[in-house]
Amino acid sequence: QEEDLPRPSISAEPGTVIPLGSHVTFVCRGPVGVQTFRLERDSRSTYNDTEDVSQASPSESEARFRIDSVREGNAGLYRCIYYKPPKWSEQSDYLELLVKESSGGPDSPDTEPGSSAGPTQRPSDNSHNEHAPASQGLKAEHLY
């Protein structure tokens, strides 16, 4: 019997509320042995794959998807999925990225860490979805 793959998690650094023009990195985490992590957006067939997977702990692997300069169009719902041969995992919860006009100092709450366990997530929903073979070296900007 094939093992059941644990659902991945998704988080955002430095947080889920990002000033226009600033950077954000989505971090997808799953078990060890993951070959490909994929970052998806809700209601889209576009995605970003990476095989640049690192070991975050003895039992966990991760991949990072960076957007160097956030635009208004980057706002929305994101989720992760991974391929551990020969199976794909279920999708993570949604993480909502909010983009705001640049303002405020470094003490503003904009850098509060965000993750799929936070208040901005939405449960996965099997009626709307997306996939394909891995292509490396693409930043998350390719989702748009």
């Epitope: 209601s43 889209r44 067939s45 995992s89 099997n126 997306e130 996939h131 989702l143």
Partner: antibody
Framework: EQSVESGGGLITPGGTLTLTCTAS????????MNWVRQAPGKGLEWIGY?????KTYYANWAKGRFTISKTSTTVDLKMTSLTAEDTGTYFC??????????????WGPGTLVTISS | ELDMTQTPASVSEPVGGTVTIKCQAS??????LAWYQQKPGQPPKLLIY???RLASGVSSRFGGSGSGTEFTLTISDLECADAATYYC????????????FGGGTEVVVK
């Protein structure tokens, strides 16, 4: 690499039909597998796709009446409450080139479905 | 919902000529547009994806351009073998769509 559709034929209105797309040379679980149909003399119409562990998207008009499912080597399209408007050629197409599940780089030859009493 | 409008419905040009087909999206799709060629009795063939990238094995006589909502397919140095119907397809959204394809353009080569 190729895919071939099967299961088409003549069916009476109101009936149910399941088409099968059989892939060879590639693993369907690594790709977005789309169904597209074409009425005689008309344009292409996207039905939906499946990927990963049975995640699906459907065109608005296809929701509820069409269901896509898969195994490791086949993808099925189940169609219910069929009408004459569903007559046409049904294609299975592989998506995923260029980071989109809707870029369809490999198509089957199609299977003809005729709905008539 | 997202709709794709293709013009013209039909175009006729002589061998060696140039054909331009336009595709308009009802909302911005960035560069997520593909073009297909379909000949009678055959399945469609992917020509161009991401608006301007040539699919494997496709002649460089085919060119794509545009972004946002306006896109163009250009076929230069027309050959008899180019006679076919051409379709555009948005490749970004799979939620809340009626059809991802445009209505098609028939190209007749004289």
């Amino acid at each position: 690499e190729q895919s071939v559709e099967s299961g088409g034929g003549l069916i009476t209105p109101g009936g149910t039909l399941t088409l099968t797309c059989t892939a060879s040379g590639f693993t369907v679980t690594r790709y977005y597998m789309n169904w597209v149909r074409q009425a005689p003399g008309k344009g292409l119409e996207w039905i939906g796709y499946i990927y990963a562990s049975s995640k699906t998207y459907y065109a608005n008009w296809a929701k509820g009446r069409f269901t896509i499912s898969k195994t490791s080597t086949t993808v099925d399209l189940k169609m219910t409450s069929l009408t004459a408007e569903d007559t046409g050629t049904y294609f299975c197409a592989r998506g995923g080139v260029g980071n989109s599940g809707l870029n369809l780089d490999l198509w089957g030859p199609g299977t003809l479905v005729t709905i008539s009493s | 919902e997202l709709d794709m409008t293709q013009t013209p419905a039909s175009v006729s040009e002589p061998v060696g000529g140039t054909v331009t087909i336009k595709c308009q999206a009802s909302q911005s799709i960035g560069s997520w547009l593909a073009w297909y060629q379909q000949k009678p009795g055959q399945p469609p063939k992917l020509l161009i994806y991401q608006a301007s990238r040539l699919a494997s094995g496709v002649s460089s006589r085919f060119g794509g351009s545009g972004s946002g909502t306006e896109f163009t397919l250009t076929i230069s140095d027309l050959e008899c073998a180019d006679a076919a119907t051409y379709y555009c397809q948005q490749a970004e959204y799979s939620g809340d769509v009626e059809n991802t394809f445009g209505g098609g353009t028939e190209v007749v080569v004289k």
